[in-house]
């Protein structure tokens, strides 16, 4: 396969592996983020269930190598797409939930990255140039946001805060980006 | 487009706290990688501490370790840097910095205006 | 903790060509220091010419360059202007903990 057969977009997807929508070049600003530091009250939603927990959103993993120009990742690397139906999990099938499980008037749920990760690629790059190193932005997890029919719909709002990062030598939080755990899964992609 | 407005000049006695602001607007903070560095008068640029995208976890610099803390309000996208037991040599202009939200990771892209800290009794 | 070094000051003769270099103490810098090089001028903030290398930024002018040159991170500074005299900064990435340089003042005479 030439160099120029290579996006140059910053992704290419293996062949065989199953194709999911390419990320973005530049990350698009237009998530609402509404989290409070340390604690504090969600805010009532008619709509949502008692247990955030409930609410399901796929996180679908796939496999692709990253390019820079003519450069191409010396390894793939695996990231997650948000993807599907957002919903509570007990609704959600198997597949991907195209079911309309919300009230008439209800409050909408998007799968969106709650979280991203770095992770450090080697490019190679033709014809004897240097290799590259970089550290691509990769989404670590998805969460659902809600959409409030009511407001704009570019409004999308969280279920409840967060706390802040955690500290070097900390264990972190479920929720927080991290590549450690993710590092293993990709030296097992192949 | 990443801006970061920080909060303005702080005049301390030696063994006081500072807290720096730093309003990220823009993008939101949980899609940035927060950084601070400092500049004492006529000195160079001090790496402080920020947070790692590759650990998930916030990292500070061996010298400022136990005296530094690094926080976020999400709520406000609004990051702080606390300076504890602040002596003379403290005495330096404050920055934020972090990176543009691009799809490779660049640190130190867009930097607060800083602000001045000065320590003294 | 590492220690990175920097000429403490150069000068360059206006249409000139310049190089500055960052070393670090624990040994040669490679690409997996992610070398950044930082403009700055008196009564104003930092700002980033160079990321990973070489790589330049919207706003960095193209007579600016970024390498490795024999174990160490360079900015090369080719047909030199009166607004580039600056101090300059190289940054060092080790594994998520970062270390300045101590600077260059670059002097356009």
């Known amino acids: 396969q030439g160099w120029q057969a290579f996006k140059n977009d910053a992704t290419e997807i293996i062949p065989g592996l199953r194709e999911y929508p390419e990320p973005p070049q530049e990350l698009e600003n237009n998530q609402t983020m509404n989290r409070a530091e340390n604690g504090g009250r969600p805010p009532h939603h008619p709509y949502d269930t008692k247990d955030v927990s409930e609410y399901s959103c796929r996180e679908l993993h796939y496999t692709r190598f990253v390019t820079d120009g003519p450069c191409r990742s010396a390894k793939p690397v695996t990231e997650l797409v948000c993807s599907g139906q957002c919903g509570p999990a007990r609704l959600l099938p198997n597949a991907i939930g195209r079911v309309k499980w919300w009230r008439p008037n209800g409050p909408d749920f998007r799968c969106i990255p709650d979280r991203y990760r770095a992770q450090r690629v080697q490019l190679l790059c033709p014809g004897g140039a240097a290799p590259r190193s970089r550290k691509v932005r990769l989404v670590a997890s998805c969460k659902c946001k809600r959409l409030t029919r009511f407001h704009n719909q570019s409004e999308l709002k969280d279920f409840g805060p967060e706390t802040a990062r955690p500290q070097k030598g900390r264990k972190p939080r479920p929720r927080a980006r991290g590549a450690k755990a993710n590092q293993a899964e990709l030296e097992n992609a192949y | 487009e990443v801006q970061l407005v920080q909060s303005g000049a702080e005049v301390k006695k030696p063994g006081a706290s500072v807290k720096v602001s730093c309003k990220v607007s823009?993008?939101?903070?949980?899609?940035?990688?927060m950084h601070w560095v400092r500049q004492a008068p006529g000195k160079g640029l001090e790496w402080m501490g920020g947070?790692?995208?590759?650990?998930?976890?916030?990292i500070y610099a061996q010298k400022f370790q136990g005296r530094v803390t690094m926080t976020e309000d999400t709520s406000t996208d609004t990051a702080y840097m606390e300076l504890s037991s602040l002596r003379s040599e403290d005495t330096a202009v404050y920055y934020c910095?972090?990176?543009?939200?691009?799809?490779?990771?660049?640190?130190?892209?867009?930097w607060g205006q800083g602000t001045l800290v000065t320590v003294s009794s | 903790q590492a220690v990175v070094t920097q000429e403490p000051s150069l000068t360059v003769s206006p249409g000139g060509t310049v190089t500055l270099t960052c070393g670090s103490s624990?040994?040669?810098?490679?690409?997996?220091?992610?070398p950044y090089w930082f403009q700055q001028k008196p009564g104003q903030a930092p700002r980033t010419l160079i990321s990973?290398?070489?790589d330049k930024h919207s706003w960095t002018p193209a007579r600016f360059s970024g390498s490795l040159l024999g174990g160490k991170a360079a900015l090369t500074l080719s047909g030199a202007q009166p607004e580039d005299e600056a101090e300059y900064y190289c940054?060092?990435?080790?594994?998520?903990?970062?270390?300045f340089g101590g600077g260059t003042k670059l002097t356009v005479l």
């Open positions: 990973d290398t070489d």
């Open positions: 947070f790692d995208p590759e650990d998930g976890e916030t």
């Open positions: 823009g993008y939101t903070l949980t899609e940035l990688s």
């Open positions: 624990t040994g040669a810098v490679t690409i997996d220091h992610y």
């Open positions: 940054l060092l990435d080790y594994g998520g903990t970062f270390v």
């Open positions: 910095a972090t990176d543009s939200a691009g799809y490779w990771y660049k640190f130190f892209q867009h």
